[in-house]
Amino acid sequence: KAMHVAQPAVVLASSRGIASFVCEYASPGKATEVRVTVLRQADSQVTEVCAATYMMGNELTFLDDSICTGTSSGNQVNLTIQGLRAMDTGLYICKVELMYPPPYYLGIGNGTQIYVIDPEPCPDSD
């Protein structure tokens, strides 16, 4: 592959439907603008979950209505996905693009399998 991107193989979402994982990339040079995209692969379909572009040294900002939040530190991005339900179980791929300065570098992680288990409803108490 092109740029190396590492992410954990498996993550278990919390009972509140929150999953966090680190996406780490090996930058060939000194990028100042980085774009991180989370993709979900289910069967052969790939859909974009969320994306953020950030300047190195600045905070990672997703859109207000995004289910993702994140922080960056050097070549590491700490990603959190919230609002997950059992049906969202799947492979979540981290895509990293070094946008500026040229040249453009692209890296795709192998994916993190996120398991989501819906909490059991609390039994009625008499």
Partner: antibody
């Protein structure tokens, strides 16, 4: 201003060897992966080889058409990348370009393999 | 290896026309696609990187779109200086294959 200047092209007989050079300036050479691309007469662009940089342990990659015959190398102290071409064939004739990860391109150098 | 299928191989259009060139890949390349312009006797020039991003100094007439396996280069209003051969390229992984090219001419 970014500049990539290729040299070393020329006429060579089939089976012969040639070493191409590419001198870079105007950007941080050591931060970049370098590639060689060629265009044969009347044909399209063909990627040949890539050499990555120190963070990537100077890994090299080749197209199937040149693997085992061509060798890419670089000298970061001289801001230069090279292509050693051995066992040349008539179909290796073309214009050879060096490129910094496809963003910046040289003007090309013509290689002619003919008896 | 990733195969690149570019179409059409040649195209003739009038000044002011909207022109589209397509590139289909044999597998998902996650937007890892560049577009180049090559004029006779000149070096290739990067137009679009990462499928949708306009390279520095390139006219906004050019735009790129697509994802997965299907990508498009669009020239919104063809100009005489756009006569050239256009190539797509996979930049996701080695070998960094190019498409076969589209030769664009003015009617």
């Amino acid at each position: 201003e970014v500049q990539l200047v290729e040299s070393g092209g020329g006429l060579v007989q089939p089976g012969g060897s040639l070493r191409l050079s590419c001198a870079a300036s105007g950007f941080t050479f050591s931060d970049n992966w370098m590639n060689w691309v060629r265009q044969a007469p009347g044909k399209g662009l063909e990627w040949l080889a890539q050499i990555r940089n120190k963070p990537y342990n100077y890994e090299t990659y080749y197209s199937a058409s040149v693997k085992g015959r061509f060798t890419i190398s670089r000298d970061d102290s001289k801001n230069s990348v090279y292509l050693q071409m051995n066992s040349l064939k008539t179909e290796d004739t073309g214009v050879y370009y060096c490129t910094a990860q496809f963003a910046y391109w040289g003007q090309g150098t013509l290689v002619t393999v003919s008896s | 290896d990733i195969q690149m299928t570019q179409s059409p191989s040649s195209l003739s259009a009038s000044v002011g026309d909207r022109v589209t060139i397509t590139c289909r890949t044999s597998e998902n390349i996650y937007g890892g696609l560049n577009w180049y312009q090559r004029k006779p006797g000149k070096s290739p020039k990067l137009l679009i990187y990462g499928a949708t991003n306009l390279a520095s100094g390139v006219s906004s007439r050019f735009s790129g779109s697509g994802s997965g396996t299907d990508y498009t280069l669009t020239i919104s209003s063809l100009q005489p200086e756009d006569v050239a051969t256009y190539y797509c390229q996979n930049v996701l992984r080695s070998p960094f294959t190019f498409g076969s090219g589209t030769k664009l001419e003015i009617k």
